[in-house]
Amino acid sequence: HTAAQDNCTCPTNKMTVCSPDGPGGRCQCRALGSGMAVDCSTLTSKCLLLKARMSAPKNARTLVRPSEHALVDNDGLYDPDCDPEGRFKARQCNQTSVCWCVNSVGVRRTDKGDLSLRCDELVRTHHILIDLRHRPTAGAFNHSDLDAELRRLFRERYRLHPKFVAAVHYEQPTIQIELRQNTSQKAAGDVDIGDAAYYFERDIKGESLFQGRGGLDLRVRGEPLQVERTLIYYLDEIPPKFSMKRLT
């Protein structure tokens, strides 16, 4: 985007440093933590966002520990390694040389090991189930209105192609949004379901990554939709490899 004296910012990612030093004085934005250039006309990858979040000053960071019931993402936040495209590297290691394999949304999918651990490929998360519970309302939301509002949200705010929102289920007060996107379905330029789900999660928690208007304003026929609990489940194209010890 073009730089102006007071308008060189990244509308899709607050966690950037922007300056008018691109070609022709264009505004160029780089993600905090990694210093990688980001495309401010679309969502930034979850890997770069996590890296930026971990690089932010501690007093400016809100650590959110996932619920114990979220069977997959229970390792909390970490400082990930991202590849040159901003995707998670298949193998992640911490400062103490403990390593593990992750899927395309950065969630651990193997037991932890040492530096000899091999992660042959980045396994794609092709199915995401977002489980929400909304605050009490006078009555249940109309299912078709709720469905339309949430589909509209993912299409407009996260630029996710409608075909990737597989279903919206509702049994008051539980809402479930199913996102599905196989490797073969994802074309160049398509937003990744993992990135969309992460932006949605941050929006729901009141930690919007967008500049400008700020927070989410979800309404169904004018009635505010306020979420009081969020759980996100991830299914990979290849099942995870955990030892039986962990399963017990």
Partner: antibody
Framework: AVTLDESGGGLQTPGGALSLVCKAS????????MFWVRQAPGKGLEWVGV????????NYAPAVKGRATISRDNGQSTMRLQLNNLRAEDTGTYYC???????????????????WGHGTEVIVSS | ALALTQPSSVSANPGETVKITCSGS???YGWFQQKSPGSAPVTVI????KRPSDIPSRFSGSTSGSTGTLTITGVQADDEAVYFC????????FGAGTTLTVL
């Protein structure tokens, strides 16, 4: 069919105030952001301001900030522009417009306008 | 708000293809037709490439980087008008307008 009807224009005195109303029909008003855009005689289009669908958010162009208030009544499918401390440069045709992307991160923008009213002319002169 | 740059005028013969460009932002472009000063604008393209249902299919929109393009394929005499681009910055902006003359 989507219809947007503006009213309230006319001759206004400098320093005075005007109140324009946009009446919408043919669509679910509650589901859309709404804009005011104006055009001075012989000039281009100028974005005046926007209000989101619930009325909880407004944003204004620097030229009218501090003088303008946009409000809406979803029950009546109407939007209002109140502009105080009128100046000669406020002269022009004022259009009500509909925004097609209420959730977009840049939803304040002109790029999402998909429908326009016929306009109401405002002349600020002593 | 950022300045949007578009040519002041373009001309074409009936049946030819016309392209009008607008540059200045990577946001979403809209294109608005105004047939005479003071007449209401009509949206021919919004959100880069979406066309209102009552607009002929000869109007199309595209974007590349920070440039938006309005294409009129098989221009007609009735398309003669001023075309304004609008874009998606924190407060929406419009270009100065391009006058299309059909020869």
């Amino acid at each position: 069919a989507v219809t947007l009807d503006e009213s309230g224009g006319g001759l206004q005195t400098p320093g005075g105030a005007l109140s324009l109303v946009c009446k919408a029909s043919g669509f679910d008003f509650i589901d859309y952001d709404m804009f005011w855009v104006r055009q001075a005689p012989g000039k281009g289009l100028e974005w005046v301001g926007v209000i989101n669908r619930s009325g909880s958010y407004t944003n204004y162009a620097p030229a009218v900030k501090g003088r303008a208030t946009i409000s809406r009544d979803n029950g009546q499918s109407t939007m209002r522009l109140q502009l105080n401390n009128l100046r000669a440069e406020d002269t022009g045709t004022y259009y009500c417009a509909r925004g097609a992307c209420t959730h977009c991160w840049d939803a304040d923008s002109a790029g999402y306008i998909d429908a326009w009213g016929h306009g109401t002319e405002v002349i600020v002169s002593s | 708000a950022l300045a949007l740059t578009q040519p002041s005028s373009v001309s074409a013969n009936p049946g030819e293809t016309v392209k009008i460009t607008c540059s200045g932002s990577s946001g979403s472009y809209g294109w608005f037709q105004q047939k005479s000063p003071g007449s209401a604008p009509v949206t021919v393209i919004y959100w880069n490439d979406k066309r209102p249902s009552d607009i002929p299919s000869r109007f199309s929109g595209s974007t590349s980087g920070s440039t938006g393009t309005l294409t009129i394929t098989g221009v007609q005499a009735d398309d003669e008008a001023v075309y304004f681009c609008g874009n998606a910055d924190s407060s929406g902006t419009f270009g100065a307008g391009t006058t299309l003359t059909v020869l």
